[in-house]
Interface confidence: low
Amino acid sequence: VLPAKPENISCIFYYEENFTCTWSPEKEASYTWYKVKRTYSYGYKSDICSTDNSTRGNHASCSFLPPTITNPDNYTIQVEAQNADGIMKSDITYWNLDAIMKIEPPEIFSVKSVLGIKRMLQIKWIRPVLAPHSSTLKYTLRFRTINSAYWMEVNFTKEDIDRDETYNLTELQAFTEYVMTLRCAPAESMFWSGWSQEKVGTTEEEAPYGLDLWRVLKPAMVDGRRPVQLMWKKATGAPVLEKALGYNIWYFPENNTNLTETVNTTNQTHELYLGGKTYWVYVVSYNSLGESPVATLRIPALNEKTFQCIEAMQACLTQDQLVVEWQSSAPEVDTWMVEWFPDVDSEPSSFSWESVSQARNWTIQKDELKPLWCYNISVYPVLRDRVGQPYSTQAYVQEGIPSAGPVTQADSIGVKTVTITWKEIPKSKRNGFIKNYTIFYQAEDGKEFSKTVNSNILQYRLESLTRRTSYSLQVMASTNAGGTNGTKINFKTLSISVLEGGGGSHHHHHHHHHH
């Protein structure tokens, strides 16, 4: 059987190193060797590259080496496959060396800001040594902020043949670290160099970008004053490196600016004690270069009726995100404030908040929340300076089985009945929404029975038991992830009821045990 016709010939010119062609098939059923015929010097010359029978049989690649690598030039390539039964030739292919030239990557030696020029970085690099001197090179500059995985790209060409090259990258963020990498190719080539080693540079610092401002309204105190917890953070889009030296807060009752109070703080939270009227609060951050734009917040009067527009809310999980969606009866509301914090009794919870614009959903990566923790999530509608009534829900990013089962006891033991009571599992041990309880009970040496009840039931009366019989029983609490058995208890049904005993006083000792 003749060898297969060589196809899919692909050639690449590694500048001043070699000219290599590959083809398929890579493997033949029987022993095959190959001959690659080349014409070069614009068709005036020809030579052969052979795969060595002893060591390179069945190897679908061959390289031509200097000094016969001519450039610029057009080559033709034809591959012959030969086995014991004969030879099969490929079609003739044509190659312009300028179009398939691959050169070394450039070497970036400096990424710096230029004094007085905002939001710009100047990149300096050395043109690759192994590149044709006269040719125009095209470049791709890839850049990203240091904490991002998403690369941006800019393409440009350089005609000059100076070894040191420069490019000014503009419209960047202030005071932000950027990672840069560069590749190049001859202008006509389809093959890019590899990427250069990455280099980091930082844009110039500016006055703070801005603040996001929020509040938690607390119940009025006995003296009528209202504690308001103000909190702020760098606005979305602010530079990662931005550091404020401090924050100026001023506030006053509506229409009464002569009662303005001012506060300076270095914290990102501050508790105000306000009267019952409407107040306006303003916060700016500052550094050595100036102040941020003013963040404004209206604190409603104590008796002000807040609007309500969120009608429903759903929390759902995707593979790696928690998504909260809500429906609103007010199409004009397009800004929302989302608060979330763990629902824990013991430790002070970490309170987080985030603004959402022009969407009725909010997404958080699962790994930003703790698995097995219940989170309270509230969404406030914000219409201009008014904040509406929140709508709240709870969510787990990952449920597990409860870390402890319900503590159980048996009460009102009768001849054929018993009332089982169990305690709710503490929040910290639930690890998910308790969806039901299952009571497993079994007479001594008897068959096990079970009864499942809703999660709002903490007591159940078992009936149709056998008189004067020892039973073991436990209650399992289940989340979506599975169930955990609680304390195992034993009880024994009575042999005779109080009524059957003729009304005499019967003191029946029963014990049940915990497991």
């Epitope: 006891q409 305690k423 034993n490 014990h511 045990h513």
Partner: antibody
């Protein structure tokens, strides 16, 4: 910090009764059971019984039923053990303890109250 | 009620000895056994729960094993600070019951 603080030592005459206290801090007794245990000099531990402070339900070892009474006051976060008709057999150290069912052990103990019954 | 028979009552030891204490339940208690250490004038402290699970912070020279009715508590290399009384306890069935205790004493 989770702690159980017991009342001080008692010297009581035979036939009298005594009420020992156990005050919790760092947790709410309504969220767990409080148990009482007895340890006579140079002897092992005996389980007297326990209370569910959330509803007052109790359970006793039959050996202590009628003799000992366990109560709780959730407003002061305190559990009590009353021992009546005291005899020399009641001379012991009495411990209150919180039981951790999730891992099957007493995870928090009071420091113990020494009760001496003597005429 | 379930009786926990603990042996020995007293155990003379020298530093570096291997200590083995046994507890035999009058009926199966599965693995619902806890071992406690009690030093003079102190409340008991958990060493092992669920028969073989070392409690948080307990040195690994303390081990427990067993299931059903026979349980063993071992101190691989006893140290001076281990002088104490050791109790087993079952919580499989109410009332909870304890072994009578094993007192480690210097030879």
């Amino acid at each position: 910090e989770v702690q159980l603080q017991q009342s001080g030592a008692e010297l009581v005459k035979p036939g009298a009764s005594v009420k020992l206290s156990c005050t919790a801090s760092g947790f709410n007794i309504k969220d767990s059971f409080i148990h009482w245990l007895k340890q006579r000099p140079e002897q092992g531990l005996e389980w007297i019984g326990r209370i569910d402070p959330a509803n007052g339900n109790t359970e006793y070892d039959p050996n202590f039923q009628g003799k000992d009474t366990i109560t709780a006051d959730t407003s002061s976060n305190t559990a009590y053990l009353q021992v009546s008709s005291l005899t020399s057999e009641d001379t012991a150290v009495y411990y209150c303890a919180r039981y951790y069912y999730g891992n099957s052990h007493f995870d928090c103990w009071g420091q113990g109250t020494t009760l001496t019954v003597s005429s | 009620r379930i009786v926990m028979n603990q042996t020995p009552k007293f155990l003379p030891i020298s530093a570096g000895d291997r200590v083995i204490i046994t507890c035999k339940a009058s009926q199966s208690v599965t693995n619902d056994v806890t071992w406690y250490q009690q030093k003079p004038g102190q409340s008991p402290k958990v060493l092992i729960h669920y028969a073989s699970n070392r409690y948080t912070g307990v040195p690994d020279r303390f081990t427990g094993s067993g299931y059903g009715t026979d349980f063993t508590f071992t101190i691989s290399t006893v140290q001076a600070e281990d002088l104490a009384v050791y109790f087993c306890q079952q919580d499989y069935s109410s009332p909870f019951t304890f072994g009578s205790g094993t007192k480690l004493e210097i030879k």
